[in-house]
């Protein structure tokens, strides 16, 4: 028998400092956690202790605090490298800035191969991008070979930037081939590592023969076997087992996000490369673990050029930033409310009598709020809290649209309400009630809207032909996380402010501010 | 001792088909994934499909795509390479070999002899 | 496609000569690069595998190096049965591609 350690990570996003335990900024150094420093204290630990290491990421590196803003991906590499990590799956995010965002920064400075099986370039830029990333890599594990493969959501295109010469292929049926051409050089031991979520993670454990272990990310899994040590409660079990379609026990694994935890996994493997057994957890990276001095060092160097960026205060809160993907996913959450009111507030242009403003909806994709911001700093909050909160870079458009398209965006907000998507639905100027006892596509049992014609406002019900203006992120305006509907039937789209800005403004001119949570959204089972 | 030995070459027209044969001994056959390359005259070699030690996973190079089937007989230690609409582009001396495994990855450590295919009207 | 491009084409040298033949990669192959002798009417024989490594059997005068994209197979002191063609191979990416071959004659 052989047994191999497979170390992961993955939807680190941008977290190359200890975190709190909501992995928003450290507040109280002594209970932070996670951060490359950190983690590479621990992954030395292992690789000193046991003989046959892997260090995998399963993408989605790229995009999440001031680091990325700044740096644009160089850091990534930088501290990756550092890390010697073995190999990279593109994530949906290493796409943020474009293929030119990923190639530069990333492809030409990583020293691990970077894969992604599913991801096929064409035009001029399948030559520009050649060997940068490959479908598969093996890599020599002591006396022995382990190939990777990888694997990228094909959603990507709806999510991120990839442009228009990537094509992005369905997972399983790209993954097949290349796991082939492994098993055809006796490569017999075979980790799929990708970027799809839990639930494909499950169908290529599942489908695609030979492919020995699955470590993914996308869906920020949290999976641990017996009392998990802090805040997430595990969807499974870790390993999570999946019986393929050929009758093997396949371990799938992930590892919540934000490097709060290392994934930590052992498979033995027989001679002939079947696992025999598999077994371990996710290591939550807590203050017990003491960071690496010369990669904290490292980082305090780096930390310098961020310093000047944006630690200037903005302003103040004093109730806590609800950005939790646990709320903004699920429910109204009061950053949701926060970035709403400051949306609709940016576009106050009191130009008619007969209005009292010419915009009163907001709309916001709750995947979009990527952090919480904790009033126990003294209530400050910086550009640099502002942009873990919003760190895509996006703009907060105008649109108009008629009712029934608004209609269709908020039955897809709820269309699979409860797997923590992004597409759900923050709101502004904006009364929604949801029955999801119903069938999904008529969830939508209320939807009032603020008037704007109107010295008093007031909530009105939608009206199908209407037309209405709507402030929304560009990404939603694009079709984005599904919305294809607000693309295909927009009747007018005007770009707007930087959406970093538009908020930070906001609080400056508030200078105190307190969101509640307000029955914007709410649920209701059979009583309409 | 350890050897590969190669039947099935000869002169074909084109158009038609031919199956090359190759016949394994000194080794457990079905620990090893196998495949086929091929030399022009006078040319370099050329890597043209390969398969897994028990059969289940090919891959082919995209010049025989659609025309060559490799296969295997692990109760009869055989390897095989079936080769349809064969074009005169096909001439070539086509040798079996083992692809290495662990420690030997990615190289051919055990060749067969070589069958000379001819393709000609 | 990965290109493998030898250097050079034919070479002439003398019994007891060191030679070096150099096998150029198209993109990062990292170190599955393998080393091949072929004689006239024979198959390939493997010499080195993973860039670097003796095969066993293989003379101690045969000696390989490099990784990422430039590599190079030495013979170290040429014995009359050394004159032959020789092929880089690499492993990293299908199509399995071979170089073009090194013709090594008796001067």
């Known amino acids: 028998a052989w047994e191999l350690t497979i170390l992961h990570t993955n939807d680190v996003h941008s977290r190359l400092e200890q975190t709190s335990e909501d992995s928003s900024k450290c507040v109280n150094a002594s209970r932070c956690m996670g951060g490359v420093a950190r983690l590479f204290t621990k992954v030395q630990q292992i690789r000193r202790a046991e003989p046959n290491v892997l260090l995998l990421d399963a993408g989605d590196q790229y995009q999440g605090t001031i680091w990325f803003t700044v740096y644009k991906g160089a850091e990534v590499a930088h501290f990756m490298n550092a890390l010697r990590y073995d190999a990279m799956a593109l994530g949906n995010h290493e796409f943020d800035n474009g293929v030119e965002g990923l190639i530069e920064p990333l492809l030409k400075e990583a020293k691990f191969p970077i894969l992604s099986a599913n991801i096929k370039a064409k035009g001029p830029l399948a030559s520009q991008i050649s060997g940068l990333y490959l479908p598969y890599k093996v890599l020599p594990v002591g006396d022995e070979v382990v190939g990777i493969v990888g694997y990228t959501s094909k959603e990507t295109p709806f999510l991120s930037n990839p442009g228009t010469n990537l094509v992005f292929e369905d997972e399983i049926t790209a993954l097949q081939p290349e796991v082939d051409k492994l098993k055809t050089l006796n490569v017999n031991k075979i980790i799929a590592l990708g970027h799809s979520g839990f639930e494909m993670d499950k169908l290529i454990a599942q489908k695609v023969r030979g492919v020995d272990v699955v470590v993914g990310g996308h869906s920020n899994t949290f999976l641990y076997t017996g009392n998990p040590p802090s805040k997430e409660v595990p969807a499974g079990k870790y390993p999570f087992i999946v019986t393929s379609d050929d009758g093997r026990k396949v371990p799938v694994v992930q590892a919540y996000a934000f490097g709060k935890y290392l994934g930590y996994l052992k498979i033995e493997f027989d001679e002939r490369g079947n696992v025999i057994s598999s077994h371990g957890n996710p290591i939550l990276l807590n203050s017990s673990i003491p960071e690496d001095p010369s990669i904290k060092a490292d980082i305090n160097k780096w930390r310098i050029k961020l310093d000047n960026y944006s630690t200037q205060e903005l302003g103040k809160t004093i109730v806590y930033l609800d950005g939790s993907s646990q709320s903004c996913r699920f429910r109204e959450c009061n950053m949701g409310n926060l970035i709403c009111d400051a949306m609709i507030n940016n576009n106050l242009r009191h130009t008619d009598e007969m209005f009292w403003n010419h915009v009163s909806m907001c709309i916001l994709n709750g995947g979009g709020i990527r952090s919480p911001i904790d009033e126990r700093n003294n209530g400050t909050i910086t550009w640099e809290n502002l942009a873990a909160v919003l760190p895509f870079g996006g703009t907060f458009d105008l649109v108009q649209l008629k009712g029934s398209t608004l209609k269709k965006a908020f039955e897809h907000s709820v269309h699979r309400y409860g797997q923590s998507t992004g597409e759900f639905l923050q709101v502004g100027g904006i009364h929604v009630v949801y029955d999801l006892s119903r069938k999904p596509g008529d969830r939508v049992v209320k939807l009032d809207v603020l008037c704007t014609k109107c010295r008093v406002p007031s909530y009105d019900p939608l009206k199908m032909d209407e037309v209405y203006k709507v402030i929304l992120p560009n990404f939603l305006a694009n079709g984005g996380d599904g919305f294809q509907m607000i693309k295909d039937e927009l009747l007018r789209h005007d770009s707007g402010d930087q959406d970093i800005n538009v908020v930070s403004t906001y609080i400056s001119k508030m200078k105190v501010i307190y969101p509640a949570v307000e029955g914007r959204i709410k649920f209701s089972t059979g009583s309409h | 001792q350890v050897q590969l030995v190669q039947s099935g070459g000869g002169l074909v027209q084109p158009g038609r088909y031919l199956r090359l044969s190759c016949v394994a001994s000194?080794?457990?056959?079905?620990?090893?994934?196998m495949h086929w390359v091929r030399q022009a005259p006078g040319k370099a070699l050329e890597w043209v499909s390969g398969?897994?030690?028990?059969?289940?996973?090919?891959t082919y190079a995209d010049s025989v795509k659609g025309r060559f089937t490799i296969s295997r007989d692990n109760a009869k230690n055989t390897l095989y390479l079936q080769l349809n609409s064969l074009t005169a582009e096909d001439t070539a001396v086509y040798y079996c070999?083992?692809?290495?495994?662990?420690?030997?990855?990615?190289?051919?450590?055990?060749w067969g002899q070589g069958t000379l295919v001819t393709v000609s009207s | 496609d990965i290109q493998m491009t030898q250097s050079p084409s034919s070479l002439s040298a003398s019994v007891g000569d060191r030679v070096t033949i150099t096998c150029r990669a198209s993109?990062?192959?990292?170190?599955?690069l393998a080393w091949y002798q072929q004689k006239p009417g024979n198959a390939p024989k493997l010499l080195i595998y993973?860039?670097?490594n003796l095969r066993s059997g293989v003379p101690s005068r045969f000696s390989g190096s490099g990784s990422g994209t430039d590599f190079t197979l030495t013979i170290s002191s040429l014995q009359p049965e050394d004159f032959a063609t020789y092929f880089c191979?690499?492993?990293?990416?299908?199509?399995?591609?071979f170089g073009q071959g090194t013709k090594l004659e008796i001067k």
């Open positions: 398969i897994s030690d028990g059969g289940s996973a090919t």
């Open positions: 000194g080794f457990n056959f079905d620990d090893y994934a």
């Open positions: 070999a083992r692809a290495g495994s662990s420690w030997y990855f990615g190289a051919f450590d055990i």
């Open positions: 993109q990062n192959i990292g170190s599955w």
């Open positions: 191979q690499q492993a990293t990416i299908f199509p399995l591609t």
């Open positions: 993973r860039a670097s």
